[in-house]
Amino acid sequence: LNTTILTPNGNEDTTADFFLTTMPTDSLSVSTLPLPEVQCFVFNVEYMNCTWNSSSEPQPTNLTLHYWYKNSDNDKVQKCSHYLFSEEITSGCQLQKKEIHLYQTFVVQLQDPREPRRQATQMLKLQNLVIPWAPENLTLHKLSESQLELNWNNRFLNHCLEHLVQYRTDWDHSWTEQSVDYRHKFSLPSVDGQKRYTFRVRSRFNPLCGSAQHWSEWSHPIHWGSNTSKENPFLFALEA
């Protein structure tokens, strides 16, 4: 572990999504115990949850969280004002929209208030930690006798998202998937009118506004085609 102490106006830079530092200690004590890693996710740029595994502590400890933005106008150290709890022990912090600045380096510091030298600091690139809400309002319409077009909406700027469409018929064992760019539109060129199709979509904050790895939840599925499929064992599992 790197033992550089980060201050709000420090000049350290990193290209990683996070960078962990801990306080050095002179003697073996409770302060040598590593603090849990903080994981932050920004939900649709409406709020952010930064959480840690509170059960990893040897005894129940209300760890405290501070944060700031490195090399920016928002470099003043802030205390968490809205803790999340797990069995009455702090396990996270929720930040509201006005406290989220995507393209500045977010620095989060976890501390044991009973042992102030025991602290860990991470630097995060929030634009790589955005998780959008699931796509909504899926609609299907026929472009021709055998061609279907799937459209959907996102509660976010379209150009910041890419999408993954999955579809299958009631005869298929697995999903077929197709990547779709910010245009949020998918065409299926040949549809079998005798089969029932199911479509679903998820979205990701990538690659134009960030490099997030996490996908949204799947949308509610939408169906198209024959409702009857007597010999098919997959249909009911699909709808469950």
Epitope: L102, Y103, Q104, Q127, N128, Y182, L208, C209, S211
Partner: antibody
Framework: EVQLVQSGAEVKKPGASVKVSCKAS????????MHWVRQAPGQGLEWMGH????????NYAEKFRSKATLTADTSTSTVYMELSSLRSEDTAVYYC????????????WGQGTTVTVSS | DIQMTQSPSSLSASVGDRVTITCRAS??????LNWYQQKPGKAPKLLIY???RLHSGVPSRFSGSGSGTDFTLTISSLQPEDFATYYC?????????FGQGTKLEIK
């Protein structure tokens, strides 16, 4: 201080290519988009495309899709725009301009590079 | 593509006047509307972003309003340095597009 410095004026013959550079300084290069905007003589502003410097993804307006190619060198904080198959209609001032993705405007602009296409 | 239509195309006014320039989008762009000022031979400068947020260093006499498809740039009291061409720009949908510009001249 944020600065975008573009390469100098170019005179090219029809059919040739030109590569315009835009060197950025004074900010974290990879947190931004770099846009390219064209302004023909006496005309308005026309958005050509942009590149996300945090990952290299690009997007173009349809009319520039086969005309312009955007690339970036993060080691030198420089963005390049190459224009191919030049025609007299490509004579214009070309600006690079940075913006944070999402809803921020283009808050810093290069000084502009004049490209003249003439036989 | 989203068309941005500015009006008027040109405008004559005097120092101290209150001036309004409008911009209409061909479809809903929410609040993703920016305004720029450009003087002859110079690069454009950002004035207003996200419909109404004043860019740092821009005088408070500039303000933006509107939403959806109709937007307004207002200069509350014209100063000599405000005579320039103004452009609106939508950042909602790729390809991003500019209005055709409004030239503000001295009366």
């Amino acid at each position: 201080e944020v600065q975008l410095v573009q390469s100098g004026a170019e005179v090219k013959k029809p059919g040739a290519s030109v590569k315009v550079s835009c060197k950025a300084s004074g900010y974290t290069f990879t947190s931004y988009w770099m846009h390219w905007v064209r302004q023909a003589p006496g005309q308005g502003l026309e958005w050509m495309g942009h590149i996300y410097l945090g990952g290299g993804a690009t997007n173009y307006a349809e009319k520039f899709r086969s005309k312009a190619t955007l690339t970036a060198d993060t080691s030198t904080s420089t963005v390049y725009m190459e224009l191919s198959s030049l025609r007299s209609e490509d004579t214009a001032v070309y600006y690079c301009a940075r913006s944070q993705p999402y809803y921020y405007g283009m808050d810093s602009w290069g000084q502009g590079t004049t490209v003249t296409v003439s036989s | 593509d989203i068309q941005m239509t500015q009006s008027p195309s040109s405008l004559s006014a005097s120092v101290g006047d209150r001036v309004t320039i409008t911009c209409r989008a061909s479809q809903d762009i929410s609040n993703y509307l920016n305004w720029y000022q450009q003087k002859p031979g110079k690069a454009p400068k950002l004035l207003i972003y996200y419909k109404s947020r004043l860019h740092s260093g821009v005088p408070s006499r500039f303000s933006g309003s509107g939403s959806g498809t109709d937007f307004t740039l207002t200069i509350s009291s014209l100063q000599p340095e405000d005579f320039a061409t103004y452009y609106c720009h939508q950042g909602h949908t790729i390809p991003f597009t500019f209005g055709q510009g409004t030239k503000l001249e001295i009366k």
